[in-house]
């Protein structure tokens, strides 16, 4: 998913040349101190370096960026803008880099960024127009087509006033921008659920990853409008059933993939119609390893392997035969 | 922009099999479908299958008959397509599609099939 | 296997011309009905797909309409390097399946 280089020969910059050069215009094609550049490959490396803020004498070749393993805190709006613009920036890196804050229009000036690696930052305070770029009801189209936002979410004692996933959703429909996004990674985030309103809003997704979370239900979600998915990735989450309706759902998307893996199903008699699904359909990938983890006496049976007589609820007593 | 680069063409015996590769380069947000079609002399398109290239799972135009075989290399970006059981009505341009709607299409591969 | 009936076959226009391509599936197809340009000797490039959305690059002369069984395809103004086959294709049901094409001219 992040950006790579084929890069042969990178050109590093001392950091006492670049100091030697700082009160003067920076050279067109310079390369950044505590960074590596290679033009043939239209890359920059800035990775490891403990850096606090953005280079502002980014070479205007550069197409990949990476700014990986550093300590910039907070991304201010039009981090990246410069005169003359990036024009060619199209994959951008900034994982593991310390950000807890991405104020609104951060990526502006950026006309041709088709790929944004966030992961692995703790973002307490994401702008909802850190993609869009304003506020207004409808923005320009972003012409990010992949984002990365995997492990995100900062410690809990770091967390806002609000809901986590709420931040994240408000980030991704903020004046529609984000249209013609085709991958979406959310892994790794603890949600608890999915607001029901992001996946219409986002009809160009072609791959979703919201593995590793905590989503126990997808009763209120609807991927109807995801019209052409074709990864859907809800491995390590705490799924318990599949109920008809998103079944139904996720059968008429005619080129999807369901990756549900590591969840703990719950094979009582609400499972009858899952197992029913996943004995027909061809759209879930390695479903003859998906195994129950309740109730005890079903644990590690194969969901595949069950029959409705292998699926009974306990009848629920009456209250006046109930016991305190 | 993705760019999908098929093998050359192929002159091929009755019987015989034939497999075209098909790379893909450029553009790194490709679909994870590869579909094959065959266009024969004057004529429509066909759809011969598909893989899901990151687990290898195949649709198949039944058609074909079980002659078609598609395989996907991901260290290489490269599927394949292979005929086998060819036959004189074989002779066709073969192409390679990505996406679920075939996005982007390579450029094609003459095969003939000829004694 | 679903049918799609496409017609006309072929059809002459003149530049500037409104030109309309009609797609018939055999069953519904749920709006998965994408349409293609073969130009002679050449590959194919999908134009218009989930019956309307324009892929990405392609002039918004090109639209298509449609629900159910029946679609269709407008060119609003037809410009010399529209000369091409056109070719309606099904993604709801497998096998995908495609119509027969129609071979645009400029008179």
């Known amino acids: 998913s992040s950006p790579t280089s084929s890069a042969s020969s990178f050109s590093s910059s001392a950091p006492f040349l670049a100091s030697a050069v700082s009160a003067q215009p920076p050279l067109p094609d310079q390369c950044p101190a505590l960074c590596e550049c290679s033009e043939a490959a239209r890359t920059v490396k800035c990775v490891n370096r403990n850096l606090t803020e953005v280079p502002t004498d980014l070479p205007a070749y550069v197409r990949n960026l990476f700014l990986t393993g550093n300590q910039l805190a907070v991304l201010p709006a039009g981090a990246f803008a410069r005169r003359p613009p990036l024009a060619e920036l199209a994959a951008l890196n900034l994982s593991g880099s310390r950000l807890d804050e991405v104020r609104a229009g951060a990526f502006e000036h950026l006309p041709s960024l088709r790929q944004l690696d966030l992961s692995h930052n703790p973002l307490a305070d994401l702008s909802p127009f850190a993609f869009s770029g304003s506020n207004a009801s409808v923005s320009a189209p972003s012409p990010l087509v992949e984002l990365i936002l995997n492990h995100i979410v900062p410690p809990e004692d770091e967390r806002q006033n609000r809901s986590f996933e709420g931040m994240v959703v408000a980030a991704l429909l903020a004046g529609r921008a984000l249209q013609g996004l085709r991958r979406l990674e959310l892994a790794s985030n603890h949600f608890l659920y999915l607001p029901r309103d992001v996946l219409a809003q986002l009809p160009s997704l072609r791959h979703l990853d919201l593995s590793n979370n905590s989503l126990v239900s997808l009763t209120y979600v609807s991927f109807r409008n995801l019209t052409h998915l074709e990864s859907l990735h809800l491995e390590d989450n705490a799924l318990k059933v599949l109920h008809n309706g998103t079944l139904a759902e996720l059968q008429g998307l005619p080129h999807i993939r369901v990756f549900l893996d590591n969840n703990p199903w719950v094979c009582d008699c609400h499972m009858a119609d899952m197992v029913t699904w996943l004995k027909e359909t061809e759209v879930v990938q390695g479903k003859d390893r998906l195994t129950c983890a309740y109730p005890e006496k079903m644990r590690n049976r194969v969901l595949l392997e069950l029959n409705s007589a292998d699926l009974d609820c306990d009848p629920i007593l009456p209250p006046s035969l109930q016991t305190s | 922009e993705v760019q999908l680069v098929q093998s050359g063409a192929e002159v091929k015996k009755p019987g015989a099999t034939v497999k075209i590769s098909c790379k893909v380069s450029?553009?790194?947000?490709?679909?994870?479908?590869m579909n094959w079609v065959q266009q024969a002399p004057g004529k429509g398109l066909e759809w011969m299958g598909r893989?899901?290239?990151?687990?290898?799972?195949?649709n198949y135009n039944g058609k074909f008959k079980g002659r078609v075989t598609i395989t996907a290399d991901t260290s290489t970006d490269t599927a394949y397509m292979e005929l086998s059981s060819l036959r004189s009505e074989d002779t066709a341009v073969y192409y390679c599609?990505?996406?679920?709607?075939?996005?982007?299409w390579g450029q094609g591969t003459l095969v003939t099939v000829s004694s | 296997d679903i049918q799609m009936t496409q017609s006309p076959s072929s059809l002459s226009a003149s530049v500037g011309d409104r030109v309309t391509i009609s797609c018939r599936a055999s069953?519904?197809?749920?709006?998965?009905l994408n349409w293609y340009q073969q130009k002679p000797g050449k590959t194919v490039k999908l134009l218009i797909y989930?019956?309307?959305r324009l892929h990405s690059g392609v002039p918004s002369r090109f639209s298509g309409s449609g629900s159910g069984t029946d679609y269709t395809f407008t060119i609003s103004s037809l410009q010399p390097e529209d000369i091409a086959t056109y070719f309606c294709?099904?993604?709801?049901?497998?096998?995908?399946?495609f119509g027969g094409g129609t071979k645009l001219e400029i008179k």
């Open positions: 069953q519904d197809i749920s709006n998965y």
């Open positions: 450029g553009y790194a947000f490709s679909s994870s479908w």
């Open positions: 294709q099904q993604d709801n049901t497998l096998p995908w399946t």
């Open positions: 893989i899901y290239r990151e687990d290898g799972h195949t």
């Open positions: 599609a990505t996406g679920g709607a075939m996005d982007y």
């Open positions: 989930y019956t309307s």
